[in-house]
């Protein structure tokens, strides 16, 4: 039975040209995290594999940085970056847990962040 839950940064906004940290946290399970995928709708952005470490998709290498932790930093944001992002935790023995974050990239300088939390 899957007992874990994923907390995410929820709905967030950021300014065009700026940076944002996408963060998820898996709790309430003792399952081993074998891999975390970061995906944007139909694209794979990056993977953190327990054995192989971080790998960034070539098309995002210039604008995506690994971390902090299992999170992902998006840089040089454009309005086209607006949309859904998914953290997909592959765990053993539980299976797969998915978290969703909606990012809105704003033209104006009034970019208000959604609920944030500290990752220990």
């Amino acid at each position: 039975m899957m007992t874990g839950t994923i907390e995410t940064t929820g709905n967030i906004s950021a300014e065009k040209g700026g940076s944002i940290i996408l963060q998820c946290h898996l709790s309430s399970t003792t399952a081993q995290v074998t891999q975390v995928n970061w995906e944007q709708q139909d694209q794979l952005l990056a993977i953190c594999n327990a054995d192989l470490g971080w790998h960034i998709s070539p098309s995002f290498k210039d604008r995506v940085a690994p971390g902090p932790g299992l999170g992902l930093t998006l840089q040089s944001l454009t309005v086209n970056d607006t949309g859904e992002y998914f953290c997909i935790y592959h765990t053993y023995p539980d299976g797969t847990y998915t978290g969703r974050i909606f990012l809105e990239v704003l033209e104006s300088s009034v970019a208000e962040h959604g609920a944030r939390f500290q990752i220990p």
């Epitope: 891999q35 995906e39 192989l52 998709s57 023995p93 539980d94 299976g95």
Partner: antibody, heavy 122, light 110 residues
């Protein structure tokens, strides 16, 4: 349309090698792992190994280690399996199959090629 | 010899339900949720029907369902139809030994 197109049937002599190809289309090739599964006539499915182009990571089932080479060419979106030291019991249909999920976790396969029949006979 | 044991054959009449079992051990099926089921018609490639014990890929009929109890996973097909006649394979995945398939079950629709 997402599909995997495999190379044609082969007839090989015992002791020789065979190389089967699997060309992917309709998706980002590097993002998904490709596994190779074979099926001898009238028998069940047998996982041989797989490759994750995203990492260039290759896993081969213990039974086939030393005899199987799995490669991928990202420029042509093609995966290959080469099986050496062929024997009659290697006669089978060889399938390539794409991982259900991106990143090469390899727990389930949602897209399959039509299979390539390899016959090993003297 | 497969590490996963399936009945060689099962049968049922149209409209009925049938269940195919897949028995492993406490170190494979009993210890994780990475169990999948495939359908294979003669001369065709396998088709994924269930993954992670009970999840259906898009496009698969909701007449197919998966479950697990202890070391045994099960595939249930309800409202049996003629086109369900095929071979069915379970599989178990572990990060160390990757994918192992059951020997397959032939489903006959009477």
């Amino acid at each position: 349309e997402v599909q995997l197109v495999q190379s044609g049937a082969e007839v090989k002599k015992p002791g020789s090698s065979v190389k089967v190809s699997c060309k992917a289309s309709g998706y980002t090739f590097a993002s998904y792992g490709i596994s190779w599964v074979r099926q001898a006539p009238g028998q069940g499915l047998e996982w041989m190994g797989g490759i994750t182009p995203f990492f260039n990571r290759v896993d081969v089932a213990e039974k086939f280690q030393g005899r199987v080479t799995i490669t991928a060419d990202k420029s042509t979106s093609t995966a290959y399996i080469e099986l050496s030291s062929l024997r009659s019991e290697d006669t089978a249909v060889y399938y390539c199959a794409r991982d259900l999920r991106r990143g090469g976790v390899g727990d389930a396969f949602d897209i399959w090629g039509r299979g390539t029949l390899v016959t090993v006979s003297s | 010899q497969s590490a996963l044991t399936q009945p060689r054959s099962v049968s049922g009449s149209p409209g009925q339900s049938v269940t195919i079992s897949c028995t492993g051990t406490s170190s494979d099926v009993g210890s994780h949720n990475y169990v999948s089921w495939y359908q294979q018609h003669p001369g065709k490639a396998p088709k994924l029907m269930i993954y992670e014990v009970s999840y259906r890929p898009s496009g698969v009929s909701n007449r197919f369902s998966g479950s697990k109890s202890g070391n045994t996973a099960s595939l249930t097909i309800s409202g049996l139809q003629a086109e369900d006649e095929a071979d069915y394979y379970c599989s178990s995945y572990t990060p160390s030994s990757a994918t192992v398939f059951g020997a397959g079950t032939k489903l006959t629709v009477l």
